[in-house]
Interface confidence: low
């Protein structure tokens, strides 16, 4: 059974009321918090989903952050820094350094590891671990779901009866975060790429650190950038042709801030698409090279584009924008052959441009076939 209440009472008796905010924080209090954290970790397996347990876990992080406790004490698992909890602390601070992830991180003499995830075209997914997949994922799917951020995409068929889909709607929920931001929702749909949150605002609300979340319109109706400095995150949303593309740069620590790995941890940017939702577009590409568009219909996961769009034309159009024959180039060819929509060339081009801007490892900008998933990997 879940023993969280035992952890609570041990902590409460150990601190005997001293956990009320105090000006002189004692090492004893921090030690009690570390013991509390250890206790919750030990009971974690049996407490999945228990409300009191999750309150306690968040509470420990919050109190450690409030009282400047190190997590590196004898009973704690060392971590680079304590990310404040995603809960609702309404206390104001005159210098909300907590609302600037990098500044806060550098105080702990470390540099955050940034990761990138992107979704574009038919749709093609580049995960935080640099896996590249082409997926069906029709309907609504979680792209990101962690303690700070929730991103959901809706994909619709690009042609009637097609297994190939593209992103027609995107919803981003920035969760209420300390003295930095109120909960904010951003929603984009086909032909509607707003430069504001759904409540009309362009920043994080009324809190001291509200400007740590900002929307900037780069190109009206076509390109929006959202900076969430409090979690060190940059998001780029574009409308290319009729459909949407998504790209994000996010610290590993935020990527992995998942409370319930059984449910939250299944999001696409982290785990990739389920095997039964993946399209082997590289085999399709090889097939296309040998057969030409005329004989593609049988092998295609989707109705092929009209015959007036031959393979050679697709290759030429993609080469024009994507001279390196990497997976973005292959994705471009796939999309042109399956949809006949030339805008997918631009989608692949901009997706690669976003990688160049957002990916921290410049050696990994181009992905090639050798990184394709092996059968059995999700």
């Amino acid at each position: 059974p879940c023993k969280i209440l035992k952890c609570n009472s041990e902590f409460w008796s150990a601190t005997s009321g001293s956990h009320a905010p105090a000006s002189d924080d004692t090492p004893e209090f921090c030690a009690a918090l570390r013991s509390y954290a250890l206790c919750t970790r030990r009971t974690a397996r049996t407490c999945r989903g228990d409300l009191a347990y999750h309150s306690a876990v968040h509470g420990i992080e919050d109190l450690m952050s409030q009282h400047n406790c190190s997590k590196d004490g004898p009973t704690s698992q060392p971590r680079l820094r304590t990310l404040p909890p995603a809960g609702d602390s309404q206390e104001r601070s005159d210098s909300p350094e907590i609302c600037h992830y990098e500044k806060s991180f550098h105080k702990h003499s470390a540099t955050p590891n940034y990761t990138h995830c992107g979704l574009f075209g038919d749709p093609h997914l580049r995960t935080f671990t640099d896996r590249f997949q082409t997926c069906k994922v029709q309907g609504a799917w979680p792209l990101i779901d962690n303690n700070y951020l929730n991103v959901q995409v809706t994909n619709t068929p690009v042609l009637p009866g097609s297994a190939a889909t593209a992103t027609s709607k995107l919803t981003i929920i920035f969760k209420n975060f300390q003295e930095c931001v109120d909960q904010k929702v951003y929603q984009a749909e086909m032909d509607e790429l707003p430069a504001a949150f759904v409540d009309g605002s362009k920043n994080g609300g009324d809190k001291h650190g509200a400007n740590s979340l900002k929307i900037t319109e780069k190109v009206s109706g076509q390109h929006v950038e959202i900076q969430a400095k409090y979690i060190g995150t940059t998001i780029v949303v574009r409308q290319v042709g009729r459909y949407l593309t998504f790209a994000v740069r996010m610290p590993e620590e935020v990527v992995n801030a998942v409370e319930d790995w059984d449910s939250q941890g299944l999001y696409l940017c982290l785990r990739g698409c389920p095997l039964n939702q993946q399209i082997d577009f590289q085999a399709f590409h090889t097939n296309a090279e040998g057969t030409g568009a005329r004989r593609l219909a049988a092998a295609s996961p989707a109705p092929t584009a009209p015959e007036t769009f031959p393979y050679e034309t697709a290759v030429a159009k993609c080469k024009e924008k994507l001279p390196v024959e990497d997976l973005y180039y292959q994705a471009c060819v796939f999309d042109l052959l399956t949809t006949g929509d030339v805008n997918f060339t631009l989608a692949a081009y901009y997706a690669l441009e976003d990688v160049k801007m957002l990916h921290s490892n410049k050696d990994k900008l181009h992905l090639y076939e050798r990184t394709r998933d092996l059968p059995g990997r999700a």
Partner: antibody, heavy 120, light 109 residues
């Protein structure tokens, strides 16, 4: 806008059961617990229990154990509270409330309330 | 009989301060970091005013403040206004139970 919308008023006979629904919108339903609280006419608030929508875990007030059942349907973001073997003292306004996430145990968003009248 | 004891009523003139106490045991209040306060106007649902003893949700005026000493938590309304006339309930999460106070009627004279 975060909202909890409850089902309409009910009139029940003693011994019967009542099931009150509470539909959530404007937030991720599985990220917050749901508490149920009741208030008899002219009386104070009385906690009945809570449920965690993503695990189904429940915690009921001792005095209602065996009579109350709380459930959720995550596909419709709806929480339900069923009270059986009704008696006249169960006449009350029943509220659902969202339990705030994070380190604090509090109820930050409330439904409008559902009046349940138990009368023969 | 509520597990947390509150005065039945308190009153004050506009602009004055009033304090509502909420007394429990060491386990229900003294050792609990989970004390919250709710305001309820007649015929309306309760509204969260303070949580974690002292914290104010956004939208709640700063004339509402909280404190705790020993086994007693307190809600203070400074600069009382007509719209503050309502019932106020303290709540504590102690172990497996959520405990409500009996409620205090605040009257603005």
């Amino acid at each position: 806008e975060v909202q909890l919308v409850q089902s309409g008023a009910e009139v029940k006979k003693p011994g019967a059961s009542v099931k009150v629904s509470c539909k959530a919108s404007g937030y991720t339903f599985t990220s917050h617990g749901i508490s149920w609280v009741r208030q008899a006419p002219g009386q104070g608030l009385d906690w009945m229990g809570w449920i965690s929508p993503y695990s189904g875990n429940t915690n009921y007030a001792q005095k209602l154990q065996g009579r109350v059942t709380m459930t959720t349907d995550t596909s419709t973001s709806t929480a339900y509270m069923e009270l059986s073997s009704l008696r006249s003292e169960d006449t009350a306004v029943y509220y659902c409330a969202r339990v705030g996430s994070g380190p604090y145990y509090y109820m930050d968003v409330w439904g409008q309330g559902t009046l349940v009248t138990v009368s023969s | 009989q509520s597990a947390l004891t509150q005065p039945r009523s308190v009153s004050g003139s506009p602009g004055q301060s009033v304090t509502i106490s909420c007394t429990g045991t060491s386990s229900s209040v003294g050792d609990s970091i989970y004390v919250s306060w709710y305001q309820q106007h007649p015929g309306k649902a309760p509204k969260l005013m303070l949580y974690d003893v002292t914290k104010r949700p956004s939208g709640v005026p700063d004339r509402f403040s909280g404190s705790k000493s020993g086994n007693t938590a307190s809600l203070t309304i400074s600069g009382l206004q007509a719209e503050d006339e309502a019932d106020y309930y303290c709540v504590s999460y102690a172990g497996t139970d959520t405990l409500f106070g009996g409620g205090t009627k605040v009257t603005v004279l």
